[in-house]
Interface confidence: low
């Protein structure tokens, strides 16, 4: 069976989110490299004007989540979590609209990051997303857009 | 059909440099990691490095660190071993292997190898 | 750096199983390491069997199987051939670097 691997993560990037916890990497050298793409995004957006706080505070876990997936415990091979479809669709749409747009329109961005494309993730309440990582975006004032 | 086809070795003086390439052809190497292994004289396998092409990531064994760099031309869907400083326990025979970035098949398939001979 | 040791050779009989073992200086080798088998036949002809411990590279024969035995990582080869007479080399996986091991001379008889 071909799967990848679930390794302890082991950077620095996304550490204060993901500490050492068991992340799935589809090669062994995938990790190093995921970390060097992942940093020179970060910087690039700690430079920006264009990331507001609201987007920030949840945009830079959810990004780190998607690059470094947890491991899915449940499973009896590799496999990694999905992000929760709902908290995608909120932060693209709402709390980090302007920010996405403004993303996916820069090369220079793109070529450092791979952005979380909503449509991919399983919907709520599917057998897949019951595992899904959730990143605690309040849901509440933004509920009527993932319905 | 994959293929690995090293090429550039020959005979160099202590403290000079070198230049291997490894042409791949019957798959795209940005979808892999291409690795060099060489092998001395009756000795055993010894790992030198290896290079993403997808992104140009490298790591090197102590052993050649700061001497040699990997690097690749995604449009000649080729990968290279630039050999600086080089010593007489550098003679060896320097293999291309592949390493799938997707699943877990290290050095699945290998060059047939070019003979680098450091001596003055 | 770590050193990784294997048998210097191992002789068996055609249809004999046989297993050949790959020991870690630094300890028990755990499926952390990776284990990796290359096949190397005359003339310079490596061929990757085995990588991830126990997964089989496309196209190599049912007969050849990865594990760890022990506090080892073996590579088993169960109905030998004569075909599979070879030196085979195993690397272990330490963090950021592969390291091989001197390999095993392997006659099949």
């Known amino acids: 069976e071909e799967d990848g691997f679930c390794q302890p993560y082991r950077g620095i990037a996304c550490a204060r989110f993901i500490g050492n916890r068991t992340v799935y990497m589809e090669s062994l050298h995938m990790q190093g490299e995921i970390e060097n793409q992942i940093t020179a995004a970060f910087t690039m957006i700690g430079t920006s004007s264009h990331l507001s706080d609201k987007c920030s505070q949840f945009a830079i876990p959810s990004l780190c989540h998607y690059a470094f997936p947890y491991c899915d415990e449940t499973s009896s091979v590799p496999k990694p979590r999905d992000l929760c479809r709902d908290e995608c669709e909120i932060l693209e749409n709402v709390l980090c609209q302007t920010e996405y747009i403004f993303a996916r329109s820069n090369p220079m961005i793109l070529m450092r990051l791979k952005l979380p494309n909503c449509e991919d993730l399983p919907q709520p309440e599917s057998p897949e997303a019951a595992n899904c990582i959730r990143i605690g975006i309040p849901m509440a004032d933004h509920h009527h857009h993932h319905h | 059909e994959v293929q690995l086809v090293e090429s550039g070795g020959g005979l160099a003086q202590p403290g000079g440099s070198l230049r291997l390439s490894c042409a791949a052809s019957g798959f795209n190497i940005t979808g892999y990691y291409i690795h060099w292994v060489r092998q001395a004289p009756g000795k055993g396998l010894e790992w030198v490095g290896y290079?993403?092409?997808?992104?140009?990531?490298?790591h090197y064994a102590d052993s050649v660190k700061g001497r040699f760099t990997i690097s690749a031309d995604t449009s000649k869907n080729t990968a290279y071993l630039q050999m600086n400083s080089l010593r007489a326990e550098d003679t060896a025979v320097y293999y291309c292997?592949?390493?799938?970035?997707?699943?877990?098949?290290?050095?699945?398939?290998w060059g047939q190898g070019t003979l680098v001979t450091v001596s003055s | 750096q770590a050193v990784v040791t294997q048998e210097s050779a191992l002789t068996t009989s055609p249809g004999e199983t046989v297993t050949l073992t790959c020991r870690s200086s630094?300890?028990?080798?755990?499926?952390?390491?990776?284990a990796n088998w290359v096949q190397e036949k005359p003339d310079h002809l490596f061929t990757g069997l085995i990588g991830g411990t126990n997964k089989r590279a496309p196209g190599v024969p049912a007969r050849f199987s990865g594990s760890l035995i022990g506090d080892k990582a073996a590579l088993t080869i169960t109905g030998a051939q004569t075909e599979d007479e070879a030196i085979y080399f195993c690397?272990?996986?330490?963090?950021?670097?592969?390291?091989f091991g001197g390999g095993t001379k392997l006659t099949v008889l």
């Open positions: 290079i993403s092409p997808n992104s140009g990531a490298t």
């Open positions: 292997a592949r390493d799938s970035r997707r699943y877990v098949r290290p050095f699945d398939y």
């Open positions: 630094t300890g028990a080798v755990t499926t952390s390491n990776y």
């Open positions: 690397a272990l996986w330490y963090s950021n670097l592969w390291v």
